[in-house]
């Protein structure tokens, strides 16, 4: 179930996709890959108000229950929701090789 | 891949399953569950420092750009990796039902 | 089976403006990068810019910075090339091309789209 | 911008010998990780430009093996080791070391 996509904080302040730049070197992946030297990195970042895009019934309930013990039970935390796949061109022992990774780059985000 | 199951910040403090004792009440369920009266929530709290159950390649990216940009990045969170169903009694138009949710409880968690 | 699929020829006036389109069928379109070249009759081939559809970022060789506009729509999976202030140099094939950032690799290519520029 | 210059601009072939084409580029194109970004398409009559070599020595996949790419730094050389009838159209070197990308001038390889 995916809840409401109206962001009570204010636009751009709630779970949403953003893009990073990032080298490989900020990556650490400088010793293994090779292309792309740089990645558009795909995350979800933003606040996880009240039933705003709850990803399911257990995201309701640390909802609920981080309203009444905001000390013990944190509130739901963005994350993706689907990914994006992306191909690297990579070192191996005999040369380089491509290989696809399905769980590298967020599609799409929610709260949970 | 599943990362490092060692918590640097001492036992307990990493991402974990925990147990909150919480009533219909506290759910906001009591107009329309009628058992169980008191629900044992299994959630996964607990912080998320470099590579600690890190869920896949995004999370492990993530900690690396959190360390770089700690203000744009957020550090991984702690979220279930998978559920333990449960089943309910509820109201229905016409008396009562036994539905079962695969989403409720929290059965293992990990870092994304 | 991936493909990029570009619109049909155009042809345009001195002057005006050309907007080629570039649809990737069948396959993931946005963790590529899309790199638009041309060819003109008879010559060799000249990169004019691309873009990262993940973010929507561009970039331009400095010979068409302000002349050419490259977009894309995450939604339909396809590419755009806008090129304003048409002359008659700018009769060309355009080419997408899929590639990983601007490192080259270009494994994919879309067929071309001949622009006639012609008064 | 890397200015890329092949040579011959012309080639005829024998059917079953071999052939060379050369390719300089007029800054660098070795990376810090000991790669040099090079590229080689093959472009056939009527067609579109294909990918034969990444990375200067990278077979693409389904390129056959009598396609060879050698070289470092500026100098650069496509090789065929028994060109083939299909093997005839324009070749171009192309430097990814930087943006803008930029190719050579092509080589166009024909039957004699």
């Known amino acids: 179930a995916r809840n409401g996509d109206h962001c009570p904080l204010g636009p751009g302040r709630c779970c949403r996709l953003h893009t990073v730049r990032a080298s490989l070197e900020d990556l650490g992946w400088a010793d293994w890959v090779l292309s792309p030297r740089e990645v558009q990195v795909t995350m979800c970042i933003g606040a996880c108000p009240s039933q705003f895009r709850a990803a399911n019934m257990h995201a309701q309930i640390k909802t609920s229950l981080h309203r009444l013990k905001p000390d013990t039970v944190p509130a739901p935390c963005c994350v993706p929701a689907s990914y994006n796949p992306m191909v690297l061109i990579q070192k191996t022992d005999t040369g380089v090789s491509l290989q696809t990774y399905d769980d590298l780059l967020a599609k799409d985000c929610h709260c949970i | 891949a599943r990362n490092g199951d060692h918590c640097p910040l001492g036992p307990g403090r990493c991402c974990r399953l925990h147990t909150v004792r919480a009533s219909l009440e506290d759910l906001g369920w009591a107009d329309w569950v009628l058992s169980p009266r008191e629900v044992q929530v299994t959630m996964c709290i607990g912080a998320c420092p470099s590579q600690f159950r890190a869920a896949n390649m995004h999370a492990q990216i993530k900690t690396s750009l959190h360390r770089l940009k700690p203000d744009t990045v957020p550090a991984p969170c702690c979220v279930p990796a998978s559920y333990n169903p449960m089943v309910l009694i509820q109201k229905t138009d016409t008396g009562v039902s036994l539905q079962t949710y695969d989403d409720l409880l929290a059965k293992d968690c990990h870092c994304i | 089976q991936v493909q990029l699929v570009q619109s049909g020829a155009e042809v345009k006036k001195p002057g005006s403006s050309v907007k080629v389109s570039c649809k990737a069928s069948?396959?993931?379109?946005?963790?590529?990068?899309i790199s638009w070249v041309r060819q003109a009759p008879g010559q060799g081939l000249e990169w004019m810019g691309g873009?990262?559809?993940?973010?929507?970022?561009?970039s331009y060789a400095q010979k068409f910075q302000g002349r050419v506009t490259i977009t894309a729509d995450e939604s339909t999976s396809t590419a755009y090339m806008e090129l304003s202030s048409l002359r008659s140099e700018d009769t060309a094939v355009y080419y997408c091309?899929?590639?990983?950032?601007?490192?080259?690799?270009?494994?994919?290519w879309g067929r071309g789209t001949l622009v006639t520029v012609s008064s | 911008d890397i200015v890329m210059t092949q040579s011959p601009l012309s080639l005829p072939v024998t059917p079953g010998e071999p052939a060379s084409i050369s390719c300089r580029s007029s800054?660098?194109?070795?990376?810090?990780?000991?790669?040099?970004?090079l590229d080689w398409y093959l472009q056939k009559p009527g067609q579109s430009p294909q990918l034969l070599i990444y990375?200067?020595?990278n077979r693409a996949s389904g390129v056959p093996d009598r396609f060879s790419g050698s070289g470092s730094g500026t100098d650069f050389t496509l090789k065929i080791s028994r060109v083939e009838a299909e093997d005839v159209g324009v070749y171009y070197c192309?430097?990814?070391?930087?943006?803008?990308?930029?190719f050579g001038g092509g080589t166009k390889v024909e039957i004699k």
């Open positions: 990375l200067g020595s």
């Open positions: 192309m430097q990814a070391i930087g943006v803008p990308l930029t």
């Open positions: 800054q660098s194109l070795l990376y810090s990780n000991g790669y040099n970004y």
């Open positions: 069948g396959g993931t379109f946005s963790s590529y990068y």
């Open positions: 091309a899929r590639g990983l950032a601007y490192d080259g690799y270009f494994d994919l």
């Open positions: 873009i990262a559809p993940i973010s929507g970022t561009a």
